[in-house]
Interface confidence: medium
């Protein structure tokens, strides 16, 4: 009984349940391979509970191990388009602070038009995650085809 | 010490750990693109702890943010079989109540025989999730090739 | 307040937050299709909190439902290489104890060079997970291309 009451009185944030699910806003200007993300109930089913967006990139607010997941679908794409424009590659990594820069997850499209993956990784408060799409094909902005998210798992 | 005891006395359901992992039962009749799922220890490694099945479709019992994941493998499939010009597509969405109908996750097979993805999404008590497979290729019912599940992540 | 203090005093392990993320160490000798994994902060971003490695295979230390995820990328691979060497298949399963041996997750590469998937499955203390890669192509050891992990979700 006591436990249940205490749990209700504590803000969720103190339990470390940081989570975010983002939808694609736009791609970067020339020479900038980054995807720019957006999130919030007004936009549909995207949200940020803990992490924040910094100029379209996701910034972590709580140290811990996170499940990072992503799906990106190329727009106006067929298996022949995808192979003709190969290599189209997506990489998710920590892009700042520079001292912690590292690629966390990388996939190539080859003859497919969608990539989807997920992984567990330690992230620290202040880490900014960037998603780089290299190649000439553009991503779909449909919210059920392209999305990016993180979920805090444990300290 | 007190916390540990209290935690043991509380039913898991009160912690919001709703989770389900389903295996394919069958595909739908004519003009019904839905996959019909089944779950339970007697069937193997599938289970439902919280969510329920309603005529083969997964119904949510607790509001919250969920991780939804799916893998579907086409049976009797090779890269040439997986149609080039008419991709077979899988979509996961809320199909009822009608007022909340939306596509959550969508993938095409292109020249592959398996799709797998996952995403975070808010779901509400009573939401029913449908998985629509469009095309003429049939899915494998092998439990390690085709499965669908949800995991409650936070309120 | 009391809850927060009690929670801080309890070791994380008692909350059941077992988690591991591994990177590829090496492939097996001839006739052994298993991938051999490694993990630990000294190696980069891989880690084991609860589960252990037994000769490169992941052994579970806590009963419960786990999210198992994997990504494997083939080295020196293009869509033509992948299709020429088809079938290249990855299977994740319980390989010991023998009485619980079962395939949990299976994917073929077809014309792609990366597979990635995830699923929820019940695992028991002492279960050892093996990842079998069949075919002639070798996996990439890049830590952002090939990884394998588990996350305890609930009892």
């Amino acid at each position: 009984q006591r436990f249940a009451q205490a749990q209700q009185q504590l803000p969720l944030e103190s339990l470390g349940w940081d989570v975010a699910e983002l939808q694609l806003n736009h791609t970067g200007p020339q020479q900038d391979p980054r995807l720019y993300w957006q999130g919030g109930p007004a936009l549909g089913r995207s949200f940020l509970h803990g992490p924040e967006l910094d100029k379209g990139q996701l910034r972590i607010h709580r140290d811990g191990i996170y499940m990072v997941h992503i799906q990106v679908t190329l727009a106006i794409c067929s298996s022949t388009t995808a192979s003709r424009h190969h290599p189209t590659t997506l990489a998710v990594g920590i892009c700042s602070p520079a001292s912690r820069s590292i690629s966390l997850l990388r996939l190539s499209f080859h003859q497919g038009c969608t990539i989807a993956s997920q992984r567990l990784t330690p992230l620290a408060r202040g880490d900014t995650l960037c998603t780089n799409l290299t190649g000439t094909l553009l991503p779909s902005r449909n919210t059920d085809e392209t999305f990016f998210g993180v979920q805090w798992v444990r300290p | 010490q007190r916390f540990a005891q209290a935690q043991q006395q509380l039913p898991l359901e009160s912690l919001g750990w709703d989770v389900a992992e389903l295996q394919l039962n069958h595909t739908g009749p004519q003009q019904d693109p839905r996959l019909y799922w089944q779950g339970g220890p007697a069937l193997g490694r599938s289970f439902l702890h919280g969510p329920e099945l309603d005529k083969g479709q997964l119904r949510i019992h607790r509001d919250g943010i969920y991780m939804v994941h799916i893998q579907v493998t086409l049976a009797i499939c090779s890269s040439t079989t997986a149609s080039r010009h008419h991709p077979t597509t899988l979509a996961v969405g809320i199909c009822s109540p009608a007022s909340r109908s939306i596509s959550l996750l969508r993938l095409s097979f292109h020249q592959g025989c398996t799709i797998a993805s996952q995403r975070l999404t808010p779901l509400a008590r009573g939401d029913t999730l449908c998985t629509n497979l469009t095309g003429t290729l049939l899915p494998s019912r092998n439990t390690d090739e085709t499965f669908f599940g949800v995991q409650w992540v936070r309120p | 307040q009391r809850f927060a203090q009690a929670q801080q005093q309890l070791p994380l392990e008692s909350l059941g937050w077992d988690v591991a993320e591994l990177q590829l160490n090496h492939t097996g000798p001839q006739q052994d299709p298993r991938l051999y994994w490694q993990g630990g902060p000294a190696l980069g971003r891989s880690f084991l909190h609860g589960p252990e490695l037994d000769k490169g295979q992941l052994r579970i230390h806590r009963d419960g439902i786990y999210m198992v995820h994997i990504q494997v990328t083939l080295a020196i691979c293009s869509s033509t290489t992948a299709s020429r060497h088809h079938p290249t298949t990855l299977a994740v399963g319980i390989c010991s104890p023998a009485s619980r041996s079962i395939s949990l997750l299976r994917l073929s590469f077809h014309q792609g060079c990366t597979i990635a998937s995830q699923r929820l499955t019940p695992l028991a203390r002492g279960d050892t997970l093996c990842t079998n890669l069949t075919g002639t192509l070798l996996p990439s050891r890049n830590t952002d291309e090939t990884f394998f992990g588990v996350q305890w979700v609930r009892p």
Epitope: - | H26, Q31, T81, H85 | -
Partner: antibody
Framework: QVQLQESGPGLVKPSETLSLTCTVS??????????WSWIRQPPGKGLEWIGY???????NYNPSLKSRVTISVDTSKNQFSLKLSSVTAADTAVYYC??????????WGQGTLVTVSS | SYVLTQLTSVSVAPGQTARITCGGN??????VHWYQQKPGQAPVLVVY???DRPSGIPERFSGSNSGNTATLTISRVEAGDEADFYC????????????FGGGTKLTVL
Amino acid sequence: QVQLQESGPGLVKPSETLSLTCTVSGGSVSTDGYYWSWIRQPPGKGLEWIGYIYYSGSTNYNPSLKSRVTISVDTSKNQFSLKLSSVTAADTAVYYCARGIGLGFEYWGQGTLVTVSS
Amino acid sequence: SYVLTQLTSVSVAPGQTARITCGGNNIGSKSVHWYQQKPGQAPVLVVYDDSDRPSGIPERFSGSNSGNTATLTISRVEAGDEADFYCQVWDRSSDQDVVFGGGTKLTVL
């Protein structure tokens, strides 16, 4: 090599039920992914799809025949069967069983002629 | 339900190219399969998914599909090619999953 063989009476009286069996060798009727199908061809005419069964029980039928058709499977004998009730002379045809994968019917039986006549 | 329209007959001299068409509303959005049926025999799948050939089918058989017409092309026609040819579509979203065309009789002159 997969082979299909139709069997059953070649003559059926009007208003009775036509019953045919297809025996499969070189493959299993319980394998995922296959549409085990019946197709017919009236003398001198084109092909008409009757229906199919898959996943050891799920069936789909041609709407024009649906009220009279039943397709079933017997996995123990590796067979699937067709029953067509209330037959008339218009049901006289060569009846084929076939295996499809959603990209065409790649294996066919040799066909059996069923005549509806009193 | 969906209707596939084929010409009743097509004639071609040996060594020439035969083109057999199959018409249907927006057929280009569907997968089309072609069968060859010789007298007294069961049909044989010669082209599937618009343009793919099963193993054992000569390269002389090819297919295309766009708009409202799918076409089976047989180059360097031989006497042994004489047969009935049927197109077929398979669409689980319609009330009739499997639809065959009426068939085209190919005569080799």
